[in-house]
Interface confidence: low
């Protein structure tokens, strides 16, 4: 995966929250849920009230990148999805407010959001070859592809 220094000269400025309180379901129709205060996992739910609700904030790149760069926050909290390394769980990082500017190693808070039909992919800005992924009997993690599941459906207005 790409080292942090590769992107260290790119600055990302917060624009606005573009989605509120949505749910992420993977290709097996499993919803992302809180495993504990640090990690996320995926489970098939009867009741979507148990699923994590996310907010998505958009950032503008100083590189004028065509990709949509986003931050993922658990709704109504100060917890932000943070990438680690390949096959490592994504972490929930607590911050007092949404970062106004992100650069260097802090890009592990950012993801490129790509859509293909109803499929949504979140590629780590810090590790551009790795995606947010679900994996059987494991936390939500960063992965390059199968056997991990990297495509998600966004469910909105589930309240």
């Amino acid at each position: 995966s790409a080292p942090f220094s590769f992107l260290s000269n790119v600055k990302y400025n917060f624009m606005r929250i573009i989605k509120y309180e949505f749910i992420l379901n993977d290709a097996l129709n499993q919803s992302i849920i809180r495993a504990n205060d640090q990690y996320l996992t995926a489970a098939a739910l009867h009741n979507l009230d148990e699923a994590v609700k996310f907010d998505m904030g958009a950032y503008k790149s100083s590189k004028d990148d065509a990709k949509i760069t986003v931050i993922l926050r658990i709704s109504k909290t100060q917890l932000y999805v943070t990438a680690q390394d390949e096959d490592q769980p994504v972490l929930l990082k607590e911050m007092p407010e949404i970062p106004k500017t992100i650069t260097g190693s802090e890009t592990n808070l950012l993801f490129f959001w790509e859509t293909h039909g109803t499929k949504n992919y979140f590629t780590s800005v810090a590790h551009p070859n790795l995606f947010i992924a679900t994996k059987q009997d494991y936390w939500v993690c960063l992965a390059g592809g199968p056997p991990s599941i990297t495509d998600f459906q966004i469910l909105e207005n589930q309240a």
Epitope: R34, D49, K76, L79, A159
Partner: antibody, heavy 118, light 107 residues
């Protein structure tokens, strides 16, 4: 410092309705969820429901559907609980509480005692 | 609904002792459990969330443990100020439900 200030004790007659209030300071209720809970002597705590003040969406324990209505006024930073067709079973202390994204309650109001008696 | 059972309605202990309050869920709730303390005439106070995380300001003599269906709140070096009722609560599924409470008496 976060504080939830509830309205004062109420003595009402059976069949009547009552509206309890919970005014928050130190937090914007639009940024959180507000819950209402019921406590009767020696009966533990019962969750009535919650509201997302940002959009007015409320959820209830099915047992309180038709009995309780939760609303919020973001301009006054206040959540409300209206109880209708009151009976002696509604005599209790009612608490408002702030729920985080996981629905445990980190801040509680001081409670409002409701007495239903003729 | 998920039923939360606190089998001991009353527990008696002495200052300096260690006491464990238990709570059982009728189905798997992971670690989505909170514990509250309610002193006589007061509102409940949050002690523990996510089964084992203490709220800020809560003394470290309060410890939460467990996952799945069985949970424990342990109070070590019990103090007279711990005279209170203790409730568990699950937040895995609606409706949110509480245990019936355990009253801690100080000998």
């Amino acid at each position: 410092e976060v504080q939830l200030q509830q309205s004062g004790a109420e003595l009402v007659k059976p069949g009547a309705s009552v509206k309890l209030s919970c005014t928050a300071s130190g937090l914007n209720i639009k940024d959180t969820y507000m819950h209402w809970l019921k406590q009767r002597p020696e009966q533990g705590l019962e969750w009535i429901g919650r509201i997302d003040p940002a959009n007015g969406n409320a959820k209830y324990d099915p047992r309180f559907l038709g009995k309780a209505t939760i609303t919020a006024d973001t301009s006054s930073n206040t959540a409300y609980l209206q109880l209708s067709s009151l009976t002696s079973e509604d005599t209790a202390v009612y608490y408002c509480a702030r729920g985080d994204g996981n629905f445990h309650f980190d801040y509680w109001g001081q409670g409002t005692t409701l007495t239903v008696s003729s | 609904d998920i039923v939360m059972t606190q089998s001991q309605r009353f527990m008696s202990t002495s200052v300096g002792d260690r006491v464990s309050v238990t709570c059982k869920a009728s189905q798997n709730v992971g670690t989505n459990i909170a514990w509250y303390q309610q002193k006589p005439g007061q509102s409940p106070r949050a002690l523990i969330y996510s089964a084992s995380y203490r709220y800020s300001g809560v003394p470290d003599r309060f410890t939460g443990s467990g996952s799945g269906t069985d949970f424990t709140l342990t109070i070590s070096n019990v103090q007279s100020v711990d005279l209170a009722e203790y409730f568990c609560q699950q937040y895995t599924r609606y409706p949110l439900t509480f245990g019936g409470g355990t009253k801690l008496e100080i000998k």
